[in-house]
Protein backbone atom coordinates (compact mmCIF):
# COMPACT_ATOMS: atom_id res chain seq x y z
CA UNK A 1 0.00 0.00 0.00
CA UNK A 2 1.13 3.55 -0.65
CA UNK A 3 2.35 5.18 2.53
CA UNK A 4 1.64 8.63 3.89
CA UNK A 5 2.72 11.44 1.61
CA UNK A 6 2.36 9.32 -1.51
CA UNK A 7 -0.42 8.14 -3.79
CA UNK A 8 -0.94 5.34 -6.31
CA UNK A 9 0.14 6.08 -9.85
CA UNK A 10 -2.11 3.37 -11.19
CA UNK A 11 -5.60 3.05 -9.71
CA UNK A 12 -5.80 -0.51 -11.04
CA UNK A 13 -2.67 -1.61 -9.21
CA UNK A 14 -2.68 0.44 -6.00
CA UNK A 15 0.45 0.12 -3.92
CA UNK A 16 2.58 -1.10 -6.78
CA UNK A 17 3.90 2.30 -7.77
CA UNK A 18 3.48 5.19 -5.37
CA UNK A 19 4.56 8.72 -6.24
CA UNK A 20 4.98 11.62 -3.84
CA UNK A 21 2.17 14.11 -3.53
CA UNK A 22 2.74 17.33 -5.45
CA UNK A 23 3.24 20.59 -3.57
CA UNK A 24 0.33 21.84 -1.50
CA UNK A 25 -1.30 18.42 -1.17
CA UNK A 26 -1.41 15.60 1.35
CA UNK A 27 -2.24 11.93 1.61
CA UNK A 28 -2.57 9.96 4.85
CA UNK A 29 -1.46 6.87 2.95
CA UNK A 30 -3.33 3.61 2.60
CA UNK A 31 -3.58 4.15 -1.17
CA UNK A 32 -5.51 7.39 -0.80
CA UNK A 33 -5.12 9.99 -3.52
CA UNK A 34 -3.46 13.25 -2.57
CA UNK A 35 -5.78 16.15 -1.80
CA UNK A 36 -5.16 19.93 -1.60
CA UNK A 37 -4.37 21.42 1.77
CA UNK A 38 -7.05 23.44 3.53
CA UNK A 39 -6.15 27.11 3.85
CA UNK A 40 -7.28 28.04 7.34
CA UNK A 41 -6.56 31.74 6.88
CA UNK A 42 -8.85 32.06 3.93
CA UNK A 43 -11.51 30.13 5.74
CA UNK A 44 -11.36 32.91 8.35
CA UNK A 45 -9.75 30.64 10.94
CA UNK A 46 -6.46 30.22 12.78
CA UNK A 47 -4.03 27.51 11.75
CA UNK A 48 -3.78 25.33 14.81
CA UNK A 49 -1.53 22.83 13.03
CA UNK A 50 0.06 23.43 9.62
CA UNK A 51 -0.48 20.96 6.82
CA UNK A 52 2.19 18.48 5.83
CA UNK A 53 2.61 15.94 3.06
CA UNK A 54 0.70 13.41 5.15
CA UNK A 55 -1.99 15.46 6.90
CA UNK A 56 -4.23 18.45 6.28
CA UNK A 57 -4.07 21.66 8.26
CA UNK A 58 -6.08 21.81 11.46
CA UNK A 59 -8.04 25.03 11.82
CA UNK A 60 -9.80 26.66 14.74
CA UNK A 61 -12.16 29.59 14.98
CA UNK A 62 -10.57 33.01 15.36
CA UNK A 63 -12.93 33.90 18.20
CA UNK A 64 -13.23 31.04 20.70
CA UNK A 65 -16.12 31.04 23.19
CA UNK A 66 -15.86 33.67 25.94
CA UNK A 67 -15.51 30.95 28.55
CA UNK A 68 -12.40 29.59 26.88
CA UNK A 69 -9.12 30.82 28.40
CA UNK A 70 -7.17 33.17 26.10
CA UNK A 71 -4.04 31.04 26.11
CA UNK A 72 -5.80 28.11 24.47
CA UNK A 73 -6.24 30.01 21.24
CA UNK A 74 -4.21 28.83 18.31
CA UNK A 75 -1.17 30.60 16.93
CA UNK A 76 -1.60 33.66 14.71
CA UNK A 77 -2.78 32.93 11.22
CA UNK A 78 0.04 32.25 8.78
CA UNK A 79 0.60 35.00 6.20
CA UNK A 80 -0.91 33.17 3.27
CA UNK A 81 -2.54 35.30 0.64
CA UNK A 82 -4.03 32.70 -1.63
CA UNK A 83 -7.63 31.70 -2.15
CA UNK A 84 -9.20 28.60 -0.62
CA UNK A 85 -8.27 25.30 -2.12
CA UNK A 86 -10.59 23.68 -4.60
CA UNK A 87 -10.94 20.26 -6.08
CA UNK A 88 -7.98 19.28 -8.24
CA UNK A 89 -8.84 18.98 -11.93
CA UNK A 90 -6.39 16.16 -12.33
CA UNK A 91 -7.73 13.29 -10.35
CA UNK A 92 -5.12 13.77 -7.71
CA UNK A 93 -2.37 16.28 -7.89
CA UNK A 94 -1.00 16.01 -4.49
CA UNK A 95 1.70 17.88 -1.55
CA UNK A 96 4.59 18.40 0.67
CA UNK A 97 5.82 21.10 2.96
CA UNK A 98 8.98 23.05 2.36
CA UNK A 99 11.34 21.30 4.79
CA UNK A 100 10.03 17.84 3.98
CA UNK A 101 11.18 15.59 1.18
CA UNK A 102 8.45 13.11 0.47
CA UNK A 103 9.58 9.53 0.02
CA UNK A 104 7.98 7.64 -2.80
CA UNK A 105 7.81 3.89 -3.15
CA UNK A 106 5.82 1.34 -1.32
CA UNK A 107 4.83 1.07 2.29
Amino acid sequence: RCRAGTQPLDSYKPGVDCAPCPPGHFSPGDNQACKPWTNCTLAGKHTLQPASNSSDAICEDRDPPATQPQETQGPPARPITVQPTEAWPRTSQGPSTRPVEVPGGRA
Epitope: D17, P23, I80
Partner: antibody, heavy 121, light 107 residues
Protein backbone atom coordinates in the same frame (compact mmCIF):
# COMPACT_ATOMS: atom_id res chain seq x y z
CA UNK B 1 -3.27 28.46 -26.11
CA UNK B 2 -1.48 27.48 -22.91
CA UNK B 3 1.65 29.58 -22.54
CA UNK B 4 4.30 30.41 -19.96
CA UNK B 5 6.25 33.60 -20.60
CA UNK B 6 9.34 34.27 -18.52
CA UNK B 7 11.19 37.48 -17.67
CA UNK B 8 14.34 38.53 -19.50
CA UNK B 9 17.98 37.64 -19.02
CA UNK B 10 19.77 38.77 -15.87
CA UNK B 11 23.42 39.42 -15.02
CA UNK B 12 24.16 39.29 -11.31
CA UNK B 13 27.12 39.64 -8.97
CA UNK B 14 28.16 36.77 -6.69
CA UNK B 15 26.35 36.98 -3.35
CA UNK B 16 23.35 38.83 -4.76
CA UNK B 17 19.85 37.54 -5.49
CA UNK B 18 17.77 37.13 -8.62
CA UNK B 19 14.01 36.89 -9.03
CA UNK B 20 12.66 35.31 -12.21
CA UNK B 21 9.00 35.60 -13.19
CA UNK B 22 6.77 33.27 -15.19
CA UNK B 23 3.43 34.57 -16.44
CA UNK B 24 0.85 31.92 -17.30
CA UNK B 25 -2.01 32.22 -19.76
CA UNK B 26 -4.52 29.98 -21.49
CA UNK B 27 -5.46 27.91 -18.45
CA UNK B 28 -6.62 28.27 -14.84
CA UNK B 29 -3.34 29.20 -13.17
CA UNK B 30 -4.28 28.30 -9.61
CA UNK B 31 -5.19 24.72 -10.49
CA UNK B 32 -1.81 23.52 -11.70
CA UNK B 33 1.41 23.06 -9.80
CA UNK B 34 4.23 25.19 -11.19
CA UNK B 35 7.78 23.91 -11.02
CA UNK B 36 11.21 25.34 -11.70
CA UNK B 37 14.04 23.54 -13.45
CA UNK B 38 17.46 24.87 -14.35
CA UNK B 39 20.06 23.95 -16.95
CA UNK B 40 23.70 25.01 -16.65
CA UNK B 41 25.53 25.66 -19.92
CA UNK B 42 26.03 22.41 -21.80
CA UNK B 43 24.58 20.44 -18.89
CA UNK B 44 21.45 18.49 -18.04
CA UNK B 45 18.28 19.46 -16.21
CA UNK B 46 18.05 20.02 -12.46
CA UNK B 47 14.76 20.31 -10.57
CA UNK B 48 14.58 23.19 -8.08
CA UNK B 49 11.08 22.81 -6.65
CA UNK B 50 7.39 23.41 -7.20
CA UNK B 51 4.47 25.38 -5.81
CA UNK B 52 0.70 24.92 -5.87
CA UNK B 53 -0.82 28.37 -6.47
CA UNK B 54 -4.16 27.50 -4.89
CA UNK B 55 -2.75 27.33 -1.38
CA UNK B 56 0.90 28.33 -1.70
CA UNK B 57 2.17 24.91 -0.68
CA UNK B 58 5.68 24.25 -1.95
CA UNK B 59 8.19 21.43 -2.25
CA UNK B 60 11.90 22.02 -2.73
CA UNK B 61 14.94 20.08 -3.81
CA UNK B 62 17.01 20.00 -0.63
CA UNK B 63 19.98 21.29 -2.63
CA UNK B 64 18.09 24.57 -3.04
CA UNK B 65 15.96 24.62 0.11
CA UNK B 66 17.93 27.35 1.86
CA UNK B 67 18.45 29.61 -1.16
CA UNK B 68 15.38 29.26 -3.39
CA UNK B 69 11.99 30.78 -2.65
CA UNK B 70 8.96 30.04 -4.81
CA UNK B 71 5.96 32.36 -4.72
CA UNK B 72 2.91 33.14 -6.82
CA UNK B 73 0.66 36.10 -7.50
CA UNK B 74 -2.71 34.68 -8.45
CA UNK B 75 -4.09 38.06 -9.41
CA UNK B 76 -1.64 38.22 -12.32
CA UNK B 77 -1.23 34.46 -12.89
CA UNK B 78 2.48 34.79 -12.28
CA UNK B 79 4.93 32.48 -10.55
CA UNK B 80 8.27 33.65 -9.18
CA UNK B 81 11.52 31.95 -8.32
CA UNK B 82 14.02 33.87 -6.21
CA UNK B 83 17.53 32.50 -5.72
CA UNK B 84 19.79 34.13 -3.16
CA UNK B 85 23.51 34.01 -2.33
CA UNK B 86 24.32 33.55 -5.99
CA UNK B 87 27.58 31.96 -7.05
CA UNK B 88 29.15 31.38 -10.43
CA UNK B 89 27.82 27.82 -10.62
CA UNK B 90 24.28 29.23 -10.55
CA UNK B 91 24.85 30.52 -14.08
CA UNK B 92 22.15 28.67 -16.01
CA UNK B 93 18.92 28.88 -17.94
CA UNK B 94 16.01 28.76 -15.51
CA UNK B 95 12.71 27.31 -16.72
CA UNK B 96 9.25 27.36 -15.21
CA UNK B 97 7.26 24.26 -16.10
CA UNK B 98 3.65 23.33 -15.46
CA UNK B 99 2.88 19.90 -14.10
CA UNK B 100 0.78 17.90 -16.55
CA UNK B 101 -2.88 17.04 -16.52
CA UNK B 102 -2.83 13.25 -16.53
CA UNK B 103 -3.47 11.91 -13.05
CA UNK B 104 -0.81 11.89 -10.35
CA UNK B 105 2.18 11.90 -12.70
CA UNK B 106 4.86 14.43 -11.77
CA UNK B 107 5.98 15.39 -15.26
CA UNK B 108 5.95 18.73 -17.04
CA UNK B 109 3.75 19.32 -20.07
CA UNK B 110 4.24 23.05 -20.65
CA UNK B 111 7.51 24.96 -20.29
CA UNK B 112 8.47 28.62 -20.33
CA UNK B 113 11.02 29.80 -22.86
CA UNK B 114 13.72 30.02 -20.21
CA UNK B 115 15.53 32.88 -18.49
CA UNK B 116 19.31 33.09 -18.68
CA UNK B 117 20.92 34.08 -15.39
CA UNK B 118 24.63 34.88 -15.52
CA UNK B 119 26.54 35.23 -12.27
CA UNK B 120 29.82 37.05 -12.76
CA UNK B 121 31.98 39.47 -10.85
CA UNK C 1 18.62 10.91 -4.57
CA UNK C 2 17.80 8.63 -7.47
CA UNK C 3 20.37 8.80 -10.26
CA UNK C 4 19.19 8.44 -13.84
CA UNK C 5 21.97 7.34 -16.18
CA UNK C 6 21.42 7.66 -19.92
CA UNK C 7 23.33 5.93 -22.65
CA UNK C 8 24.77 6.66 -25.02
CA UNK C 9 25.55 10.29 -24.25
CA UNK C 10 25.47 10.95 -27.99
CA UNK C 11 24.83 9.05 -31.19
CA UNK C 12 24.90 9.68 -34.90
CA UNK C 13 22.11 8.40 -37.08
CA UNK C 14 20.51 8.94 -40.46
CA UNK C 15 16.97 9.86 -41.43
CA UNK C 16 14.89 6.68 -41.43
CA UNK C 17 17.04 4.89 -38.85
CA UNK C 18 15.59 3.20 -35.80
CA UNK C 19 17.13 4.74 -32.69
CA UNK C 20 16.96 3.47 -29.12
CA UNK C 21 18.08 5.44 -26.07
CA UNK C 22 18.37 3.81 -22.67
CA UNK C 23 17.95 5.18 -19.17
CA UNK C 24 18.95 3.29 -16.04
CA UNK C 25 17.68 4.27 -12.59
CA UNK C 26 19.83 3.74 -9.50
CA UNK C 27 16.85 2.13 -7.77
CA UNK C 28 13.43 0.77 -8.66
CA UNK C 29 11.21 3.58 -9.93
CA UNK C 30 8.36 1.38 -11.13
CA UNK C 31 7.05 2.99 -14.30
CA UNK C 32 7.34 6.56 -13.03
CA UNK C 33 9.49 7.81 -15.90
CA UNK C 34 9.00 10.59 -18.42
CA UNK C 35 10.96 11.45 -21.57
CA UNK C 36 11.60 14.90 -23.03
CA UNK C 37 13.02 16.26 -26.26
CA UNK C 38 15.05 19.45 -26.28
CA UNK C 39 16.38 21.36 -29.26
CA UNK C 40 19.21 23.91 -28.99
CA UNK C 41 18.10 27.17 -27.41
CA UNK C 42 14.62 25.83 -26.72
CA UNK C 43 12.76 24.47 -23.71
CA UNK C 44 12.24 20.72 -23.31
CA UNK C 45 9.05 19.14 -24.66
CA UNK C 46 7.24 16.24 -23.00
CA UNK C 47 7.14 13.13 -25.18
CA UNK C 48 6.31 10.21 -22.88
CA UNK C 49 5.07 9.78 -19.32
CA UNK C 50 4.31 6.70 -17.22
CA UNK C 51 7.20 5.02 -19.09
CA UNK C 52 5.20 4.30 -22.24
CA UNK C 53 2.27 6.72 -22.59
CA UNK C 54 2.68 9.24 -25.40
CA UNK C 55 1.81 12.81 -24.55
CA UNK C 56 -0.87 14.55 -26.63
CA UNK C 57 0.28 15.31 -30.14
CA UNK C 58 3.47 13.25 -30.01
CA UNK C 59 4.00 11.23 -33.22
CA UNK C 60 3.62 7.47 -32.87
CA UNK C 61 7.17 6.88 -34.09
CA UNK C 62 8.15 7.71 -30.49
CA UNK C 63 7.64 4.88 -28.03
CA UNK C 64 8.76 4.23 -24.48
CA UNK C 65 9.23 1.02 -22.60
CA UNK C 66 10.65 -0.59 -19.50
CA UNK C 67 9.94 -0.68 -15.78
CA UNK C 68 11.86 -1.01 -12.56
CA UNK C 69 15.32 0.31 -13.33
CA UNK C 70 15.70 -0.02 -17.10
CA UNK C 71 13.88 2.17 -19.61
CA UNK C 72 14.06 2.86 -23.32
CA UNK C 73 12.94 5.55 -25.73
CA UNK C 74 12.71 4.35 -29.31
CA UNK C 75 12.28 6.41 -32.45
CA UNK C 76 11.13 3.92 -35.07
CA UNK C 77 12.06 5.97 -38.12
CA UNK C 78 14.15 9.05 -37.44
CA UNK C 79 12.89 12.25 -39.04
CA UNK C 80 14.88 15.46 -39.68
CA UNK C 81 13.03 17.23 -36.86
CA UNK C 82 14.01 14.51 -34.37
CA UNK C 83 17.66 15.55 -34.17
CA UNK C 84 17.80 16.87 -30.62
CA UNK C 85 18.79 15.96 -27.08
CA UNK C 86 16.57 13.57 -25.12
CA UNK C 87 16.21 13.39 -21.34
CA UNK C 88 14.58 10.88 -19.03
CA UNK C 89 13.09 11.90 -15.67
CA UNK C 90 11.94 9.87 -12.67
CA UNK C 91 9.06 10.95 -10.45
CA UNK C 92 8.76 8.12 -7.94
CA UNK C 93 10.57 10.19 -5.32
CA UNK C 94 11.69 13.70 -4.47
CA UNK C 95 13.88 15.27 -5.59
CA UNK C 96 12.70 14.75 -9.14
CA UNK C 97 15.78 13.88 -11.17
CA UNK C 98 16.74 13.78 -14.84
CA UNK C 99 19.19 11.79 -16.86
CA UNK C 100 22.25 13.48 -18.30
CA UNK C 101 20.79 13.53 -21.81
CA UNK C 102 21.42 11.79 -25.12
CA UNK C 103 22.25 13.94 -28.12
CA UNK C 104 21.01 12.53 -31.43
CA UNK C 105 23.06 13.99 -34.26
CA UNK C 106 22.93 13.68 -38.03
CA UNK C 107 25.38 11.12 -39.41
Amino acid sequence: QVQLVQSGAEVKKPGSSVKVSCKASGYTFKDYTMHWVRQAPGQGLEWIGGIYPNNGGSTYNQNFKDRATLTVDKSTSTAYMELSSLRSEDTAVYYCARMGYHGPHLDFDVWGQGTTVTVSS
Amino acid sequence: DIQMTQSPSSLSASVGDRVTITCKASQDVGAAVAWYQQKPGKAPKLLIYWASTRHTGVPDRFSGGGSGTDFTLTISSLQPEDFATYYCQQYINYPLTFGGGTKVEIK
